[in-house]
Amino acid sequence: MMTGTIETTGNISAEKGGSIILQCHLSSTTAQVTQVNWEQQDQLLAICNADLGWHISPSFKDRVAPGPGLGLTLQSLTVNDTGEYFCIYHTYPDGTYTGRIFLEVLESSVAEHGARFQIP
């Protein structure tokens, strides 16, 4: 059991061609965040480093924008973007915290945002 908790945007949906913000928030710890990695399955999308700033993986540069904050904006969504996304917080001295978001990209305009939930 780790000290802190990660709150995420949870299960979310968005329209094909649109954009979505992936957001995580680490709370209940005094640990310092040195880096946040954003991953889709095992693929690294982006890194936000406390010293070096943002780095977007070259293969996602056209469709991924940094922020707001430590979050990530996905643009020009396709059905293939449906799946799990992970925010990985590297902190000291706590170690690594991971949050999970499931995104469903819909063909229709019936896209709703899911409720927020907590991952211990």
Epitope: M1, T30, Q32, T34, I47, L52, Y92, P93, G95, T96
Partner: antibody, heavy 122, light 107 residues
Framework: QLQLQESGPGLVKPAETLSLTCTVS??????????WTWIRQPPGKGLEWIGT???????FHNPSLKSRVTIPVDTSKNQFSLKLSSVTAADTAVYYC??????????????WGQGTLVTVSS | DIQMTQSPSSLSASVGDRVTITCRAS??????LNWYQQKPGKAPKLLIY???SLQSGVPSRFSGSGSGTDFTLTISSLQPEDFATYYC?????????FGGGTKVEIK
């Protein structure tokens, strides 16, 4: 097998700056999952945490050493260093570098260098 | 800062003895307590992390227990190579702090 090796002068004069380097082999200092640490042990005494650094340069140091400590990182050489300014005889110790790991909550120090004795004397 | 207090500071024991070392934190550190063994002239070696998890390659005669403020390192049957100094360390918060050490000597 990960190895850490400390290097630097064994004798430093009072009021000068102690400089040590830790060279990491068998693994990358740029690993996102690990932090790198300096610990010291005065002769015949216990262990004292000096500070910890991330590959990107974020540092955490012991407030008891005030602002005397800096821990630079050189990822191109797979090294991190310790610079301790305005040293006195009380800084005489064996200095160890270590890795923070494995990938568990609030990780311990799992790999250590063999240590190097630094004596502060005129 | 979190103070770590070890007891005893030294003990004498014989090969085959069961040895218990205690470590007390000045405030709750959950289970974020690690144990190290150090032999003269050598670097410390990680034995136990997260209070009770055995580090890879460490003999099963070493075990750890406890949570909150009170922790124990037990050597079930002391071997000749176990004569050394043992340190506890909290990784709950910075500054990271160590106990003063317990020297295990031959009786």
């Amino acid at each position: 097998q990960l190895q850490l090796q400390e290097s630097g002068p064994g004798l430093v004069k009072p009021a000068e700056t102690l400089s040590l380097t830790c060279t990491v082999s068998g693994g990358s200092i740029s690993s996102y999952d690990h932090y790198w640490t300096w610990i010291r042990q005065p002769p015949g005494k216990g262990l004292e945490w000096i500070g910890t650094v991330y590959y990107s340069g974020s540092t955490f140091h012991n407030p008891s050493l005030k602002s005397r400590v800096t821990i630079p990182v050189d990822t191109s050489k797979n090294q991190f260093s310790l610079k301790l300014s305005s040293v006195t005889a009380a800084d005489t110790a064996v200095y160890y570098c270590a890795r923070v790991g494995p990938d568990v909550s609030h990780p311990p120090f799992d790999y250590w260098g063999q240590g190097t004795l630094v004596t502060v004397s005129s | 800062d979190i103070q770590m207090t070890q007891s005893p500071s030294s003990l004498s024991a014989s090969v085959g003895d069961r040895v218990t070392i205690t470590c007390r934190a000045s405030q709750s550190i959950s289970s974020y307590l690690n144990w190290y063994q150090q032999k003269p002239g050598k670097a410390p070696k990680l034995l136990i992390y997260a209070a009770s998890s055995l580090q890879s390659g460490v003999p099963s005669r070493f075990s750890g227990s406890g949570s909150g403020t009170d922790f124990t390192l037990t050597i079930s049957s002391l071997q000749p190579e176990d004569f050394a100094t043992y340190y506890c360390q909290q990784s709950y918060s910075t500054p990271i702090t160590f106990g003063g050490g317990t020297k295990v000597e031959i009786k």
